[in-house]
């Protein structure tokens, strides 16, 4: 259940945390899973355990394998597994997919790229940053604490970013590199007066008495993230929650679905076991944002079930 993938490059430092948590005071025992051999805690060893951390200083390809950690709490022991893979250094600039950390997205307003796993290491500023293997230079790039800030982000800033830092352990220095992709989101968003795509104004919806019926209120509000936008249903001008009919409930459909770049919202009105009196109600689909409110009204009409006898008359 508690298995975590970790990877690194040969001759670099790699530090792995036990996937099971515990307090700093709890003993954590580490084992090499294949042999059940205990991993030493003495720091003179190249691979050693230090509480919740397993340290490879430096890592070797032969270290690859599954490591077991057991957290000894006052109640029950808890076991985790660290699946470690150490790769040979690439001769060319390409960083293969298996060495990449999660992709991050940025925009004009927010362009921070965090250096992955750095919190596990004893490092000192500054971090070195590279894009597609080229050292980043120029005033647009600022290495700040454990992240890189890019000013005035442009589409061309997308790419693979590598952070490089030095881990210090008892006076010895070890290099660490980590790479992640950065994508740029177009944030040229705008907001419009709500446009209701469904239902049509004054639509008549045919329903069968005793069956369930669904009405979808769907509206779009502009492009990009919207500050305030909502769709809802009203019955005879009253909020669904205040109307007090448990058979009639609304639930959010697809939230902020960016089809064609548009920010749209759906709200589904579910009517269980349709009754005659439901046909007398006025159903209003409301869409509102900072520009204002738009309303489309729907009425229900009885769908006459096909009279199978008459077909053969």
């Amino acid at each position: 259940k508690f298995s975590k993938q970790s990877w690194g490059l040969e001759n670099e430092a790699l530090i792995v945390r036990c996937p099971r948590q515990g307090k700093p005071s709890y003993t954590v025992d580490w084992y090499y899973s294949q042999t059940n051999k205990s991993i030493p805690t003495q720091e003179r060893n190249r691979v050693f355990a230090s509480g919740q951390l397993l340290k490879f200083l430096p890592a070797a390809v032969a270290d690859s394998g599954i490591y077991t950690c057991i957290v000894r709490s006052p109640t029950f022991n808890r076991t985790g597994y660290a699946n470690v893979t150490i790769y040979k250094k690439q001769s060319d600039c390409n960083v293969p997919d298996y060495l990449m950390y999660s992709t991050v997205s940025g925009s004009e307003k927010n362009s921070k790229i965090y250096c992955p796993t750095i919190d596990l290491y004893n490092w000192t500023a500054p971090l070195e940053w590279f894009k597609n293997c080229q050292a980043l230079q120029g005033s647009r790039y600022r290495a700040h604490k454990s992240f890189l800030v890019i000013d005035n982000v442009m589409t061309e800033d997308a790419g693979d970013y590598t952070c490089k830092f030095i881990h210090n352990e008892n006076g010895a220095n070890y290099s660490v590199t980590a790479t992640r992709s950065f994508t740029v989101k177009d944030e040229q968003g705008f907001s419009l007066f709500p446009v209701i795509g469904a239902p049509a104004q004054n639509e008549i919806k045919e329903v069968e008495i005793g069956k369930n019926a669904n009405l979808t209120c769907s509206a779009c509000f502009g492009k990009g993230t919207q500050f305030l936008a909502a769709v809802l249903w009203q019955l005879n001008g009253t909020k669904i929650t205040d109307f007090g009919e448990p058979r009639i409930q609304q639930e959010e459909g697809q939230n902020q679905s960016f089809s064609n770049g548009l920010a749209c919202l759906d709200m589904v009105l579910r009517i269980a076991d349709v009754k005659e009196e439901d046909l007398l109600l006025q159903y209003d689909c409301l869409a509102l944002n900072l520009h204002g409110l738009r309303r489309h009204t729907v009425r229900l009409s009885r769908k006459n079930p096909i009279d199978h006898h008459s077909i053969y008359c």
């Epitope: 307090k23 709490s73 006052p74 109640t75 029950f76």
Partner: antibody, heavy 121, light 107 residues
Framework: EVQLVQSGAEVKKPGESLKISCKGS????????IGWVRQMPGKGLEWMGI????????RFSPSFQGQVTISADKSITTAYLQWSSLKASDTAMYYC??????????????WGQGTTVTVSS | DIQMTQSPSSLSASVGDRVTITCQAS??????LNWYQQKPGKAPKLLIY???NLETGVPSRFSGSGSGTDFTFTISSLQPEDIATYYC?????????FGGGTKVEIK
């Protein structure tokens, strides 16, 4: 299928003794802690204690220490909760629950169906 | 003993509503907290272990978070079958202790 099956409901008089059981199946009984949880009528859950059938190691809540005995017979994969002298306040539903192995634990992941104990004169 | 304080003790919500229950431990328990669901007349059932991990087979509308002393349990969209009492339980120290429970009802 992993399951814990408890003995049936009991009606007793104050001062009488009682032993209820919990039979484990579908897993390695000796490798998992088994515990007991009390639920008085209309109230919440109270943890009583546990036993490790592999070596009969036990742990008790101070509230139940000395009030009950927890034991296990690994040959028939059954854990027991017993009272030597019942009181009216022992009237409750008693659940047994599996508590993880000696090396790993994920909460009380398997529960018995419960045994109702009624103590009344 | 570690005291577990659960709130609210009961709540009423509509189908589809987001429901949140909190549990506070009297001391740091790391992430050693579990959540259980008990339906009327039934045995409790484990939903979440280690504060945030969903037990196998439990619907994804249930989630948990928190560490240290403050924990939260959430039902993202309440369903009729979620009518039950929910309990938190710490297992950082013996004796294991449960919160007082939160009874969830449908409006």
């Amino acid at each position: 299928e992993v399951q814990l099956v408890q003995s049936g409901a009991e009606v007793k008089k104050p001062g009488e003794s009682l032993k209820i059981s919990c039979k484990g199946s579908g897993y390695s009984f000796t490798n998992y802690w088994i515990g007991w949880v009390r639920q008085m009528p209309g109230k919440g859950l109270e943890w009583m204690g546990i036993i490790y059938p592999g070596n009969s190691d036990t742990r008790f809540s101070p509230s139940f220490q000395g009030q009950v005995t927890i034991s296990a017979d690994k040959s028939i994969t059954t854990a027991y909760l017993q009272w030597s002298s019942l009181k009216a306040s022992d009237t409750a539903m008693y659940y047994c629950a599996r508590h993880g192995t000696s090396s790993d634990y994920y909460g009380l992941d398997v529960w018995g169906q419960g045994t109702t104990v009624t103590v009344s004169s | 003993d570690i005291q577990m304080t659960q709130s609210p003790s009961s709540l009423s919500a509509s189908v589809g509503d987001r429901v949140t229950i909190t549990c506070q431990a009297s001391q740091d328990i790391s992430n050693y907290l579990n959540w259980y669901q008990q339906k009327p007349g039934k045995a409790p059932k484990l939903l979440i272990y280690d504060a945030s991990n969903l037990e196998t087979g439990v619907p994804s509308r249930f989630s948990g978070s928190g560490s240290g002393t403050d924990f939260t349990f959430t039902i993202s969209s309440l369903q009729p079958e979620d009518i039950a009492t929910y309990y938190c339980q710490q297992d950082d120290n013996f004796p294991l202790t449960f919160g007082g429970g939160t009874k969830v009802e449908i409006k």
